[in-house]
């Protein structure tokens, strides 16, 4: 913003108020003009002489029209678990938000006082409700015919796949397994031959990438492409 | 580019109040006062008054003072003008209008807000 | 307050003609503090001239604004079509602000 045009103080009609950008001095009885953000008040104004402005020095801020005799300190630089989305400038303080991942547990006026790491959901339980910036994610329980193999800070529980004929029943962290009941195509050295199941993933699944297994673990995955799913999730 | 997005017509009973809304875009709300003006139909401009959405600080002129209440949402940018115990007279069209910051001109206006008062 | 006055209510010009109305307070106003608006039928007025002399953004150059103290005044160089309005003064030299009832400028 532009410096206001200096102007001589004046007393306010009886009954009447200074205009905007301005404030009645009590000692000098007059209307003053008060200094633009980025500046604060280096002389207040008496009966004769308007209000001095000046700068803000390196590190301090003025948000606001003001006659305050200093300008207010930016906060301390955003701590590691942060990133600074507002620099320190002459008209407006540091502003520090939490990192993806994070969440902020302790909020100020502007930005974060505090981040906490998001809750990761352990295998058998899915998220209820997404972190957001200012509240932790929610884990559920996996509902019979759901699972959840990961420990994820995004991932819900997933319906079991269908099969013919299940070779191993699925629970809340592990998907159904089926038996294969037709030759399968050749897959890479190592790998399990396993059918295509009846059928993917419900309809009211959302896509979601391979489930990831522990070290050690070898999960019988379907072969071939498997269409995306449609819709989202249900609880 | 600076807006000024004003709510839609009110049409109110006499003796009712009214809360008109003025949204913000494309500058710092927080920065700039924003005025209200009242025209009647064929008539001439009329300040209400003004509010400074950074701290809150509003200005009226004396006739409007306890008709008008002036707020700002600054988490929204949208200031709001509430009209109360209104009659005939208070039909009119409310404008939101910035103050440039510098020579105390109007330099960008809301689309106005007609408010209708009839029983 | 500073009531402002301004003259004539109506007027009408031809195309090309030169056009000026006047604003007149009722105690002496700075000139940064004096500004002209301009306002079509079912639209919001339009900052036109702010500070006596000075064009806001896309305002032609055949406007023109001159004046001090209490006296002011809007010209118009060569009538448009365009130029058809009303046209208000408005004070913020002291508070409240005020407003000038309006010139409403007609093709003849």
């Known amino acids: 913003l532009p410096a206001q045009v200096a102007f001589t103080p004046y007393a306010p009609e009886p009954g009447g108020t200074c205009r905007l950008r301005e404030y009645y001095d009590q000692t000098a009885q007059m209307c003053c003009s008060k200094c633009p953000p980025g500046q604060h008040a280096k002389v207040f104004c008496t009966k004769t002489s308007d209000t001095v402005c000046d700068s803000c020095e390196d590190s301090t801020y003025t948000q606001l029209w003001n006659w305050v005799p200093e300008c207010l300190s930016c906060g301390s630089r955003c701590s590691s678990d942060q990133v600074e989305t507002q620099a320190c400038t002459r008209e407006q303080n540091r502003i520090c938000t939490c990192r993806p991942g994070w969440y902020c547990a302790l909020s100020k006026q502007e930005g974060c006082r505090l981040c906490a790491q998001l809750r990761k959901c352990r295998p058998g339980f899915g998220v209820a409700r997404p972190g957001t910036e200012t509240s932790d994610v929610v884990c559920k329980p996996c509902a019979p015919g759901t699972f959840s193999n990961t420990t994820s800070s995004t991932d819900i529980c997933r319906p079991h796949q269908i099969c013919h004929v299940v070779a191993i029943p699925g629970n809340a962290s592990m998907d159904a397994v089926c038996t294969s009941t037709s030759p399968t195509r050749s897959m890479a050295p190592g790998a399990v031959h396993l059918p295509q199941p009846v059928s993917t993933r419900s309809q009211h699944t959302q896509p979601t990438p391979a489930p990831s297994t522990a070290p050690g673990t070898s999960f019988l995955l379907p072969v071939g492409p498997s269409p995306p799913a449609e819709g989202s999730t249900g609880d | 580019e600076v807006q000024l997005q004003q709510s839609g017509a009110e049409l109110a009973r006499p003796g009712a109040s009214v809360m008109l809304s003025c949204k913000a875009s494309?500058?710092?709300?927080?920065?700039?006062?924003m005025q209200w003006l009242k025209q009647r139909p064929g008539q001439g401009l009329e300040w209400i008054g003004a509010?400074?959405?950074?701290?809150?600080?509003?200005r009226y002129t004396q006739k409007f003072k306890g008709k008008a209440t002036l707020t700002a949402d600054k988490s929204s940018s949208t200031a709001y003008m509430q009209l109360s115990s209104l009659a005939s007279e208070d039909s009119a069209v409310y404008y939101c209008?910035?103050?440039?910051?510098?020579?105390?001109?109007?330099?960008?206006w809301g689309q106005g807000t007609s408010v209708t008062v009839s029983s | 307050q500073i009531v402002l006055t301004q003259s004539p209510t109506i007027m009408s010009a031809s195309l090309g003609e030169r056009v000026t109305m006047t604003c007149t307070a009722s105690?002496?106003?700075?000139?940064?503090?004096l500004h002209w608006y301009q306002q079509k039928p079912g639209s919001s007025p339009k900052l036109w001239i702010y500070?006596?002399?000075n064009l806001a953004s896309g305002v032609p150059a055949r406007f023109s604004g001159s004046g001090s103290g209490t006296s002011y005044s809007l010209t118009i160089s060569s009538m448009e079509a365009e130029d058809a309005a009303t046209y208000y003064c408005?004070?913020?030299?002291?508070?409240?602000?005020?407003f000038g009832g309006g010139t409403k400028l007609e093709i003849k």
């Open positions: 509010i400074y959405p950074g701290d809150g600080d509003t």
């Open positions: 408005h004070q913020y030299h002291r508070s409240p602000p005020t």
């Open positions: 494309g500058y710092t709300f927080t920065s700039y006062w």
């Open positions: 209008v910035r103050d440039d910051g510098l020579y105390y001109a109007m330099d960008y």
């Open positions: 105690s002496s106003v700075s000139s940064s503090y």
């Open positions: 500070s006596t002399s």
